[in-house]
């Protein structure tokens, strides 16, 4: 008995093949004997089964001796064993339908887990494999999951099963809602403005939910909410802000915020969150401020770097086009009596220079 | 033999609305899917909409929500309801018959309609 | 849904001339292509279907082949009432894709 693999929703065609190539007589039918359709001449005539008004044939085939039984939006239950009934013969095709789906909503947030669930016939002992769009295998039965989801999990994923021998094949379209970065950090001079972008690692039709970012100050003994938003069909609205700093909010996506200047006590780090409508959790950016200040007072020059620094970044002040004349790795590196001329405080990560300051040193008369 | 006679086409403004007829001959009428293909002036074949022997409809993506195909089987005529036209719905509308049913090849054509939108 | 991609757009060749025109499907159509001729102010006529099928009354210098995505359309020897335009349809679902059209003229 020949076995043929469907996809619930898909559209299958079973074979049926004559020995003369001509159009004869044939019926299809089920395993109770119920006809599904069959010709009278070269025209089609379907019988009482529950598969009437999705079942189909093709008559330019009859001609050739083909006469096959097409059967669309296919059902878990139209599994079963088909018989076409041609020139006193009866070949048989056992159908399996299966269907595979995903837990709950194919859009899941960073860090929640991935369920498909397979749906197969009565007596079917299927195995199943799927293959996350970074190359990821997981095996399974009944049930695969996936927990922790990732940024990189978000894609195509392919899942065949396997049945006597045979196999199936599913796309599944999974969405991974989270930031593009997990963490960033803004390097920038006294007074500078500052700009914070949350770009969004996925694109949806429609994007609502409300957000908010929270502010630790290096300074501050404890943090603080900076402003809350509402997102509504991918249009931003600020709901409160505080009055320092003042920032200002971009209107559309990405999320992009303003602080007009970068001061001492605002460098630190925040936590922006967006909670998604109709979604349980919420996405997370982490956002750092570094900010650096280069200061003469009298016969001392000074350069200082206030926020979350790494251990293993430097701090050098030197003169133009002149070597060091002092790295450190430490927050606050100063030169006294420096000599006349433009320096230059620099922030450095392994020689790439991340922020730099300049200042001018002018002669003592 | 097999005959198809296109009729109602002409000149409409864009968001007007036009009914094409086909009045078939020849064959069972009835036992048969039925197309309509149109050609852009100056294109290629495309496909429009299909209705197949028990009233089943399908639509290009094209004119879906805005075209609606229907049968008389009693008058043996075939039409395309069109609605919301716009300018690049301008073409020669041409009715076809299947082979048989609507998984198979058109076997029979028209000589097509013209249909012009233009303010 | 299912494109389908013909070539040559534009044809030239003599009368007596062996031509070739190819479809390839966005995806595999399981042999169910047809093939169409249509003359200026005129409907298409069916020439092959289900790949190498002859539509009766059309003469044998057509001939079709082809499986999976690709197909090809063949006239083995070109007569001058072969100079038309040459459509491929692909009915593997009842949303049916023609090609682009190869516009056959004479060199």
């Known amino acids: 008995k020949k076995v043929v693999l469907g996809k619930k929703g898909d559209t299958v065609e079973l074979t049926c093949t004559a020995s003369q190539k001509k159009s004869i007589q044939f019926h299809w039918k089920n395993s109770n004997q119920i006809k599904i359709l069959g010709n009278q001449g070269s025209f089609l005539t379907k019988g009482p089964s529950k598969l009437n008004d999705r079942a189909d044939s093709r008559r330019s085939l009859w001609d050739q001796g083909n006469f096959p039984l097409i059967i669309k939006n296919l059902k878990i239950e139209d599994s079963d064993t088909y018989i076409c009934e041609v020139e006193d013969q009866k070949e048989e095709v056992q159908l399996l339908v299966f269907g595979l789906t995903a837990n709950s909503d194919t859009h899941l947030l960073q860090g929640q887990s991935l369920t498909l669930t397979l749906e197969s016939p009565p007596g079917s002992s299927p195995s199943v494999q799927c293959r996350s769009p970074r190359g990821k295998n997981i095996q399974g039965g009944k049930t695969l999951s996936v927990s922790q989801l990732e940024l990189q999990d978000s894609g195509t994923w392919t899942c065949t099963v396997l049945q006597n021998q045979k196999k199936v094949e599913f796309k599944i379209d999974i969405v991974v809602l989270a930031f593009q970065k997990a963490s960033s950090i803004v390097y920038k001079k006294e007074g500078e403005q500052v700009e914070f972008s949350f770009p969004l690692a996925f694109t949806v039709e429609k994007l609502t939910g409300s957000g908010e970012l929270w502010w630790q100050a290096e300074r501050a003994s404890s943090s603080k909410s900076w402003i809350t938003f509402d997102l509504k069909n991918k249009e931003v609205s600020v709901k409160r802000v505080t009055q320092d700093p003042k920032l200002q909010m971009g209107k559309k996506l990405p999320l992009h915020l303003t602080l007009p200047q970068a001061l001492p006590q605002y460098a630190g780090s925040g936590n922006l969150t967006l909670a998604l409508e109709a979604k349980t959790g919420k996405l997370h950016q982490e956002v750092n401020l570094v900010v650096m200040r280069a200061t003469q007072l009298q016969k001392n020059l000074t350069c200082e770097v206030w926020g979350p620094t790494s251990p293993k970044l430097m701090l050098s002040l030197k003169l133009e086009n002149k070597e060091a004349k002092v790295s450190k790795r430490e927050k606050a590196v100063w030169v006294l009596n420096p000599e006349a001329g433009m320096w230059q405080c620099l922030l450095s990560d392994s020689g790439q220079v991340l922020l730099e300051s300049n200042i001018k040193v002018l002669p003592t008369w | 033999e097999v005959q198809l006679l296109e009729s109602g086409g002409g000149l409409v403004q864009p968001g007007g609305s036009l009914r094409l007829s086909c009045a078939a001959s020849g064959f069972s009428f009835s036992n048969y899917a039925m197309s309509w293909v149109r050609q852009a002036p100056g294109k290629g074949l495309e496909w429009v909409a299909s209705?197949?022997?028990?009233?089943?409809?399908f639509y290009a993506d094209s004119v879906k929500s805005r075209f609606t195909i229907s049968r008389d089987n009693s008058k043996n005529t075939l039409y395309l309801e069109m609605n919301s036209l716009r300018a690049e719905d301008t073409a020669v509308f041409y009715c076809s018959r299947h082979y048989g049913g609507s998984y198979d090849p058109m076997d029979y054509w028209g000589q097509g309609t013209t249909v012009t939108v233009s303010s | 849904d299912i494109q389908m991609t013909q070539s040559p757009s534009s044809l030239s060749a003599s009368v007596g001339d062996r031509v070739t025109i190819t479809c390839r499907a966005s995806q595999d159509i399981n042999k169910y292509i047809a093939w169409y001729q249509q003359k200026p102010g005129k409907g298409p006529k069916l020439l092959i279907h289900y790949t190498s099928i002859l539509h009766p009354g059309v003469p044998s210098r057509f001939s079709g082949s082809g499986s999976g995505t690709d197909y090809t359309l063949t006239i083995s020897s070109l007569q001058p009432e072969d100079f038309a335009t040459y459509y491929c349809?692909?009915?593997?679902?009842?949303?049916?894709?023609f090609g682009q059209g190869t516009k056959l003229e004479i060199k």
């Open positions: 209705i197949n022997e028990w009233g089943s409809t």
């Open positions: 349809l692909q009915y593997d679902n009842p949303l049916q894709t």
